[in-house]
């Protein structure tokens, strides 16, 4: 790497997760330096020869970039001077998971930090009333998950109830043969109640809520990445 500078600078990374087939960001910040031409950013991945990305003298240098990252990476060039060394990663693959190192050299010194990048698939669930069923039921669907998640139902009225006996969950492999569509049906639901469909794997947790009354149906969904942060 060959770094000059007498002092160590603070470099901070955040553990993050990438959604397979989507674009992701590997976060890294450092002590700002207004001298852009003196900043060197190197991203490395454990077990990979060559670089993930290099930015120096105010521009990218991809001459040492590993083939698996070709055409897939970029730093936020206009934000480098304010200490942003985060890396954009196009079309996240399962094989992108691993330990990355963000190396920084500036006129103030040098520093590095590691980052654990998890990859998988996660998506918002959508709950609908299944009017085709013989009894009133709810259908919870989420298009893309990996690894295979667990699915659980809960209800505001019957808190703590186990709905495994009155629900049926299936996992259907998507066309790219990695991610799966999650479908869970909850039977024998009652109106004037709020039901929650919770989908979770080791990367993300998603919850879909539905409130069914005589006059309306209200829905809400949320997605939370697990173990994200410094």
């Amino acid at each position: 790497f060959g770094i000059s500078g007498k002092h160590f600078i603070t470099v901070t990374t955040f553990t993050s997760a990438g959604n397979i087939g989507e674009d992701g960001t590997l976060s890294c910040t450092f002590e700002p330096d207004i001298k852009l031409n003196g900043i060197v950013i190197q991203w490395l991945k454990e077990g990979i020869k060559g670089l993930v990305h290099e930015f120096k003298e105010g521009k990218d240098d991809l001459s040492q970039q590993h083939e698996m990252f070709r055409g897939r990476t970029a730093v936020f060039a206009d934000q480098v001077v304010v200490g942003n060394a985060s890396l954009r990663l196009k079309n996240v693959q399962l094989t992108d998971a691993g330990t990355y190192t963000c190396y920084i050299r500036t006129s103030k010194g040098k520093g590095n930090a590691n980052l654990e990048y998890k990859t998988g698939a996660f998506s918002m669930p959508e709950i609908n009333v299944d009017y085709n069923a013989s009894s009133e039921s709810l259908r919870c669907e989420a298009p893309r998950w990996f690894p295979q998640p667990t699915v659980a139902w809960a209800s505001q009225v019957d808190q703590g109830a186990n709905f495994s006996e009155v629900s049926n969950t299936s996992f259907e492999l998507n066309s790219e043969n990695v991610t799966m569509k999650v479908v869970s049906v909850l039977y024998n639901v009652t109106i004037n109640n709020t039901y929650s469909c919770m989908i979770e794997n080791d990367i993300a947790k998603a919850t879909g809520d539905i409130k069914v009354t005589d006059s309306e149906v209200k829905r809400r969904s949320q997605l939370q990445l697990l173990n994200s942060g410094p």
């Epitope: 087939g21 991809l62 897939r72 990476t73």
Partner: antibody, heavy 120, light 107 residues
Framework: QLQLQESGPGLVKPSETLSLTCTVS??????????WGWIRQPPGKGLEWIGN???????YYNPSLRSRVTISVDTSKNQFSLKLSSVTAADTAVYYC????????????WGQGTLVTVSS | EIVMTQSPATLSVSPGERATLSCRAS??????LAWYQQKPGQAPRLLIY???TRATGIPARFSGSGSGTEFTLTISSLQSEDFAVYYC?????????FGGGTKVEIK
Amino acid sequence: QLQLQESGPGLVKPSETLSLTCTVSGGSIKSGSYYWGWIRQPPGKGLEWIGNIYYSGSTYYNPSLRSRVTISVDTSKNQFSLKLSSVTAADTAVYYCAREGSYPNQFDPWGQGTLVTVSS
Amino acid sequence: EIVMTQSPATLSVSPGERATLSCRASQSVSSNLAWYQQKPGQAPRLLIYGASTRATGIPARFSGSGSGTEFTLTISSLQSEDFAVYYCQQYHSFPFTFGGGTKVEIK
């Protein structure tokens, strides 16, 4: 302003090798954030990406053409070149060179294109 | 490879009217899509990248939208110089692929 210009023979015989050169002016081919690509367009048809090269010499080719394509770079002349071997009439097309972003990977600008006809 | 399908093949529009061009990908390309304009005898010209970001010097009447598999190029008020063929291109994964094009002609 950056400009690209294709050059090479307009007529190539079947089974021979098509050779084209793209000369870059108004900027350096060593600009780090870009690849340099080739795209072709058969008469009256759509566009097909052939492949690209980085100034350091690393290449990536369209799998459909990989066995016949070679792209090379000469940084001292600010040029990059395309060779396509064992050509047939199906390779008759307008061949364009273009600057390709390292990511996002859009093509801009393009050369004006050169028509290469494969015929005996 | 990802197949890009454009519709309609030909669009007849009067000057001053709005033109809406569609591009569909055979699988999700996120926002990794570009649009180009090509006039007869000329090279394509970049209009939009990142699905919605206008390239330098492109008039505001050109706008792009969409993500995943469905994309749209809208020309809000067609000028005489806008009659051309328009191509979409995905750069989500190698090999990069183009749609078959939409010809915008004068009605």
